[in-house]
């Protein structure tokens, strides 16, 4: 605690500081999302969103942030993703976003308002001052896990999984030694917060990268482990090998081609 206190005074943490122009970026993204990307959300007041976001971490110790701190923001940014349209991902962020860029009716967390606002940003405040710390923020490994960014993603990931319904897809990286990683956000948060009374199937897409690769990665031991966890929760599990992710990129190059979406 004394180390935290000293560090808070010096504001020297092990991670990078708040992203430059953070308040402006949040407001700009909010306006773009609610007015252009998803006009159904145009009722959202972006100034209120920023105030609630700010309220979650400003003047608070950046190692003592709780999920409760983000509840006002979650309430304001509440959004319903249609059933069968949730795409989770683990170590396939770029590919998952290429997919939803083409298949516009499918949502990753970063395609929802709150995920869109915070994607790739860093932020933290300082204890007992209303300042935003642009110099450094706590690193999850070096400093503490209850930092503003980590707690935010854990909170919104939990909510995203809880609200999913129907068939949920997850895109996994077949090039990793552990295709399903229990320590990832998907493995530690999302898997355990899917609601069996709403979600009837989790379908894993194991993305291959190798040209000419024809292994069945759905037989990987970590996938069997995922199947066990999901089945124990009374959710049907399915796994598919996806061998040609380059098709995403080719479609993304010409997004104006509406035939590239899989409504055949």
């Amino acid at each position: 605690v004394s180390r935290w206190h000293q560090q808070s005074q010096r504001s020297q943490w092990g991670g990078r500081g708040t992203t430059d122009r953070f308040p402006e970026i949040i407001l700009e993204r909010c306006v773009e999302y609610t007015q252009t990307l998803l006009p159904e959300m145009r009722h959202v007041d972006c100034q209120n969103i920023w105030d609630a976001f700010k309220g979650a971490f400003i003047s608070k110790h950046p190692c003592k942030i709780t999920e409760e701190d983000y509840q006002p923001l979650l309430k304001l940014g509440n959004q319903t993703v249609p059933c069968n349209k949730t795409l989770l991902w683990s170590r396939t962020k770029h590919l998952a976003h290429q997919y939803t860029e083409i298949q516009r009716d499918v949502f990753t967390l970063e395609d929802t308002l709150l995920g869109y606002l915070a994607d790739d940003l860093t932020w933290c405040g300082e204890f007992e001052t209303s300042e935003i710390n642009y110099r450094s923020c706590p690193d999850w490994r070096k400093d503490c896990s209850s930092n503003p960014v980590s707690v935010f993603w854990k909170t919104v990931s939990r909510r995203f999984a809880e609200s999913a319904c129907g068939v949920v897809h997850v895109m996994l990286n077949g090039s990793c030694s552990n295709i399903f990683d229990k320590k990832s956000t998907f493995g530690s948060v999302e898997v355990h917060n899917l609601q069996p009374e709403k979600v009837h199937t989790l379908e894993a897409w194991v993305m291959h990268d190798g040209r000419g690769d024809s292994r069945d990665l759905c037989q990987d031991p970590s996938i069997k482990e995922l199947e066990l966890i999901i089945s124990k929760r009374n959710i049907t599990f399915s796994c598919k090998n996806i061998y040609r992710p380059d098709k995403f990129l080719q479609c993304a190059k010409t997004p104006e081609d509406s035939s590239c979406i899989s409504k055949i």
């Epitope: 069945d216 598919k240 090998n241 098709k247 080719q250 479609c251 081609d257 899989s262």
Partner: antibody
Framework: QVQLVESGGGLVQPGGSLRLSCAAS????????MNWVRQAPGKGLEWVSG????????YYADSVKGRFTISRDNSKNTLYLQMNSLRAEDTAVYYC?????????????WGQGTLVTVSS | DIELTQPPSVSVAPGQTARISCSGD??????VYWYQQKPGQAPVLVIY???KRPSGIPERFSGSNSGNTATLTISGTQAEDEADYYC??????????FGGGTKLTVLG
């Protein structure tokens, strides 16, 4: 609407060569994998070859590897199959087929086919 | 390489349900596609991604895939459904395979 029109089939002697073409229209040609599938008289379907949209990746069935070459000209919206060292067992209707997008690898659209007969 | 096995023929009375199977090792780990082919015509995609129906395909066509077997189901079979049906899957690289085909006969 999507249209695929094959041409270039005909009668050829064993050991001979033939070049098939497939003219595509009604979609952004460069966004899709394209394929050749054949069907011998009275037999089932057999996938022959496939090519990615860009076209850096090409794939061949073992039965034609080293003899057939798939290529495409995205500026002309045309798919090709160069067939060399033809054998009697290559006699078939050859279909040009457009792949499904994204996670799916099946054939959404097919041409009407062009008949290749290898006989002396 | 996976091998897909289909029954050579299936017969069904009009209005009844026809089921055509397609089996292969761990087939559930791969998406399956079904094509209908009538004499002298090119194949037509009737099911993709195990169970999805392309636009324009009647609702009586459905598909499933579990274990080692995928199934094409035609409920309320009509005379016009008489055709050859092929299943297909892709197991990476140059392993794109079709089943041997099933001739569906609508009796009467």
């Amino acid at each position: 609407q999507v249209q695929l029109v094959e041409s270039g089939g005909g009668l050829v002697q064993p050991g001979g060569s033939l070049r098939l073409s497939c003219a595509a229209s009604g979609f952004t040609f460069s966004s899709y994998y394209m394929n050749w599938v054949r069907q011998a008289p009275g037999k089932g379907l057999e996938w022959v070859s496939g090519i990615s949209g860009d076209p850096s990746n090409t794939y061949y069935a073992d039965s034609v590897k080293g003899r057939f070459t798939i290529s495409r000209d995205n500026s002309k919206n045309t798919l090709y199959l160069q067939m060399n060292s033809l054998r009697a067992e290559d006699t078939a209707v050859y279909y040009c087929a457009r792949d499904l997008p994204l996670v799916y690898t099946g054939f959404a659209y097919w041409g009407q086919g062009t008949l290749v007969t290898v006989s002396s | 390489d996976i091998e897909l096995t289909q029954p050579p023929s299936v017969s069904v009375a009009p209005g009844q349900t026809a089921r055509i199977s397609c089996s292969g090792d761990n087939l559930r780990h791969y998406y399956v596609y079904w094509y209908q082919q009538k004499p002298g015509q090119a194949p037509v995609l009737v099911i993709y991604g195990d169970s999805k129906r392309p636009s324009g395909i009647p609702e009586r066509f459905s598909g499933s895939n579990s274990g080692n077997t995928a199934t094409l189901t035609i409920s309320g079979t009509q005379a016009e459904d008489e055709a050859d049906y092929y299943c297909q899957t892709y197991t990476g690289g140059a392993s794109l395979v079709f089943g041997g085909g099933t001739k569906l006969t609508v009796l009467g």
